[in-house]
């Protein structure tokens, strides 16, 4: 079987940065310890600019 | 149109409390986490308190730590900010702000994209 | 908690100038820095997240670049709009602190 998605919900300790396994509209938010509602990461072409080049990370990682 | 509208801000005396309210619109508050920042007359900004309402986690900056609490009511889409023994300090606008978070290998990347207009609080005697 | 040092406190500038503003963090928050500017009276608006990337609806005049400790604003050209206060805020970990702010006047 593939790997399944994980939704964890649970509040995380102060020092934990390691992204917890979200599920597909979700990513993990630091600030707050918990996996929140994240919307697509925008490029140039639709609207956000940067120096830096936003890469594949469109969507959360597959769980392993 | 996305929008948070603040209430409930006004003159107190020192030890009294206060609620305000964070109605929002536009958004679901229930899968993002709400901010509660204020700011001092002629002052920077300072953050007070979060929650993500989906499961009620809620932190809270040591200056107001056991006497705000953030609570929020997903089925009215509005989050509140009790304050109690309210202190001269506590003087300042407070903002509601919503977090936005753009996924960023399974990680948020964001920051306070909409905001209140602010209510302010007077606390004096 | 992590402490955001702004610099300058304020600047005088003239429309069309280059201006850029700094703000180090007390300890490494990778990119995690958003930058807002604030008018009087008014809600501060998103200008930058995530270190440098423009956030949508922002004039392209403003650039942010940084990770680690060290980050700076830029505006490319300073416009009369551009008269305000600006703060940066680090997000990675609770509490989200700010900047003591950067106000730009007119020179």
């Known amino acids: 079987m593939g790997a399944r998605r994980l939704r964890v919900r649970s509040q995380r300790s102060r020092d934990s940065s390691v992204p917890t396994q979200c599920n597909q509209t979700e990513c993990f938010d630091p600030l707050v310890r918990n996996c929140v509602s994240c919307e697509l990461f925008h490029t140039p072409d639709t609207g956000h600019t940067s120096s830096l080049e936003p890469g594949t990370a469109l969507q959360p990682q597959e769980g392993s | 149109e996305v929008q948070l509208v603040e209430s409930g801000g006004g003159l107190v005396q020192p030890g009294g409390s206060l609620r305000l309210s964070c109605a929002a619109s536009?958004?679901?508050?229930?899968?993002?986490?709400i901010h509660w920042v204020r700011q001092a007359p002629g002052k920077g900004l300072e953050w007070v308190a979060w929650?993500?309402?989906?499961?009620?986690?809620?932190d809270y900056a040591d200056s107001v730590k056991g006497r705000f609490t953030i609570s929020a009511d997903t089925s009215k889409n509005t989050a509140y900010l009790q304050m109690n023994s309210l202190r001269a300090e506590d003087t300042a606008v407070y903002y509601c702000?919503?977090?936005?978070?753009?996924?960023?290998?399974?990680?948020?990347?964001?920051?306070?994209?909409?905001w209140g207009q602010g209510t302010l609080v007077t606390v004096s005697s | 908690d992590i402490q955001m040092t702004q610099s300058p406190s304020s600047l005088s500038a003239s429309v069309g100038d280059r201006v850029t503003i700094t703000c180090r963090a007390s300890?490494?928050?990778?990119?995690?820095v958003a930058w807002y500017q604030q008018k009087p009276g008014k809600a501060p608006k998103l200008l930058i997240y995530?270190?440098?990337f423009l956030y949508s609806g922002v004039p392209s005049r403003f650039s942010g670049s940084g990770s680690g400790t060290d980050f700076t604003l830029t505006i490319s050209s300073l416009q009369p709009e551009d008269f305000a206060t600006y703060y940066c805020?680090?997000?990675?970990?609770?509490?989200?602190?700010f900047g003591q702010g950067t106000k730009v006047e007119i020179k």
């Open positions: 805020q680090q997000s990675l970990i609770t509490p989200p602190t």
């Open positions: 300890q490494d928050v990778s990119t995690a």
């Open positions: 929650i993500t309402p989906f499961n009620g986690t809620t």
């Open positions: 702000a919503r977090r936005v978070c753009y996924n960023r290998l399974g990680v948020c990347a964001g920051g306070m994209d909409y």
């Open positions: 995530s270190a440098s």
């Open positions: 536009g958004f679901s508050i229930r899968s993002i986490s």
